[in-house]
C-alpha cells in the first residue's frame, strides 16, 4: 500500500471550492485480510515530521473506513456538509476532501492518513500532504490552480 498526492500545492481565491486528493495505491493488499481507516486533518510542517500534529478541519473530524465485512461504511460523525465539506472515496483509490467557499482561514497544510489494519493490528500509518493557499480576491486568479509535487516530494510518508 502506498499513498500519493497528485498535487502538492493548491492556490485558490476566496470563495472558490477546492478538492484536495490523495491516491491510495493498494495493489498488494487486494483480496487479503486488510482493512483501512482513513481521515483528513490539518497539520503543520514540523521540524522532524510533517503531519504529526492533528487539528480538525473546520472543527470537523472525519472518520472513514473500508472494512471487508462492511465495505460501504462511511463513519463520519456528522454530515460534513454542515461544515461546508465533502469527503469522498472512489473505487480507484482516490480519497478526497472538498472545501466549499474557501476563506483565508482555510489556508494550511492538509494531511490524509490511511491506516492499514491487518488481523486487528494497525500495521502501517501512511500520510499524504498538500498545502492550500487561499488568496484575497484582489488581483488573484478567478479559479484554483493545482501544482504537482516535485519528484522527491511525491511519495507518501510512512510511519510503522
Amino acid at each position: 500500500i502506498k499513498v500519493t498526492t497528485p498535487y502538492s500545492l493548491y492556490v485558490c481565491p476566496e470563495g472558490q471550492n477546492v478538492t484536495l486528493t490523495c491516491r491510495i495505491l493498494d495493489s498488494v493488499s487486494k483480496g487479503h485480510d486488510a482493512n483501512f481507516l482513513k481521515t483528513w486533518f490539518l497539520s503543520s510542517r514540523g521540524e522532524v515530521q510533517v503531519c504529526k500534529e492533528h487539528r480538525p478541519i473546520r472543527n470537523f473530524i472525519s472518520h472513514h473506513q473500508h472494512h471487508r465485512s462492511h465495505p460501504a461504511v462511511n463513519a463520519s460523525h456528522d454530515q460534513p456538509q454542515k461544515h461546508g465539506l465533502e469527503i469522498a472515496y472512489d473505487n480507484h483509490g482516490n480519497f478526497s476532501i472538498t472545501l466549499h467557499n474557501v476563506t483565508l482561514s482555510d489556508s494550511g497544510l492538509y494531511c490524509c492518513l490511511v491506516i492499514e489494519v491487518k488481523h486487528h493490528h494497525p500495521e502501517r500509518r501512511l500520510y499524504g500532504y498538500m498545502e492550500l493557499q487561499v488568496q484575497t480576491g484582489k488581483g488573484s486568479a478567478s479559479t484554483c490552480t493545482a501544482y504537482p509535487p516535485n519528484e522527491q516530494d511525491s511519495d507518501s510518508i510512512t510511519a510503522a
Epitope: 500534529e53 473530524i61 473506513q65 460523525h77 492518513l113 489494519v117
Partner: antibody, heavy 119, light 107 residues
C-alpha cells in the same frame, strides 16, 4: 512497557486547587501521543478532563475549561493536572491515560488515584 | 456534546451465553471504542474503531455498528468477563465522551 502512575494528595479542601502528577515510564511524552486526564465518579461515570499533546498543546473539556490547567515537565517525563475552586462534586478517581492521535482511543491507563474534596 | 447511552444498565448471564451490549449516540458518530473495567482496576481497551480488537483481546469479543448505533458482542461468556463495559467517542471533540456503562455479571 509503557506505564503511567498518578500521584498527589488524596484530600483537598473545598475552594482549594487540586494538583496531580502523572509519571510516565517506558516512553517519552515528547515523542508522540496525547496525554490525558480522565476522572470517574459514581454519579457521572467517566469524564474526560483534557490532554496535552507530545508537542505541548492543550485541549480541555469545555465544561471544566475555566478551572483546568494541564502542563508538563519534560525533564521528569511527567504531566500534571491542576483543578481550581474545587467542590464536593470534584470528588473522584483521577486517571491519566495515553491516546494515539488516530483513531483516538486510550491504549494505556494509569491505575488511578482517589481524591476526596472535604473540609 | 455527543451523549452516549448504553443499554442495558445491567446484564446477568450464564457462562457460554452470548452477550449483546448497545451504545447509542445522540447524533451520528464515527468510530466507537469499547473498554472493560473490573473493580479496583483501570479501564482496559477492548475494541477500537468500532471493529478491531485491542492487543491481547480474545476473539470472542467483537464490535459492530455505525452512525448512532453500535454493539459490543461477547460470543461465549466466561466468568472473567464480569465487569463494567464502557463505550467512548472522539468524533465530536472536545469533549471526548463516554457512555454510562453496562454492568455485566456472568454467573
Amino acid at each position: 512497557q509503557v506505564q503511567l502512575q498518578e500521584s498527589g494528595p488524596g484530600l483537598v479542601k473545598p475552594s482549594d486547587t487540586l494538583s496531580l502528577t502523572c509519571t510516565v515510564s517506558g516512553y517519552s511524552i515528547t515523542s508522540d501521543y496525547t496525554w490525558n486526564w480522565i476522572r470517574q465518579t459514581p454519579g457521572k461515570g467517566l469524564e474526560w478532563i483534557g490532554h496535552i499533546t507530545y508537542s505541548g498543546s492543550v485541549s480541555y473539556n469545555p465544561s471544566l475549561r475555566s478551572r483546568v490547567t494541564i502542563s508538563r515537565d519534560t525533564s521528569k517525563n511527567q504531566f500534571s493536572l491542576k483543578l481550581s475552586s474545587v467542590t464536593a462534586a470534584d470528588t473522584a478517581t483521577y486517571s491519566c491515560a495515553r491516546a494515539l492521535y488516530y483513531p483516538w482511543y486510550f491504549d494505556v491507563w494509569g491505575t488511578g488515584t482517589t481524591v476526596t474534596v472535604s473540609s | 456534546e455527543i451523549v452516549l447511552t448504553q443499554s442495558p444498565a445491567t446484564l446477568s448471564l450464564s457462562p457460554g451465553e452470548r452477550a449483546t451490549l448497545s451504545c447509542r449516540a445522540s447524533s451520528s458518530v464515527g468510530y466507537i471504542h469499547w473498554y472493560q473495567q473490573k473493580p479496583g482496576q483501570a479501564p482496559r481497551p477492548l475494541i477500537y474503531a468500532t471493529y478491531y480488537r485491542a492487543t491481547g483481546i480474545p476473539a470472542r469479543f467483537s464490535g459492530s455498528g455505525s452512525g448512532t448505533d453500535n454493539t459490543l458482542t461477547i460470543s461465549s461468556l466466561e466468568p472473567e468477563d464480569s465487569a463494567v463495559y464502557y463505550c467512548q467517542q472522539w468524533s465530536s471533540y472536545p469533549p471526548i465522551t463516554f457512555g454510562g456503562g453496562t454492568k455485566l455479571e456472568v454467573k
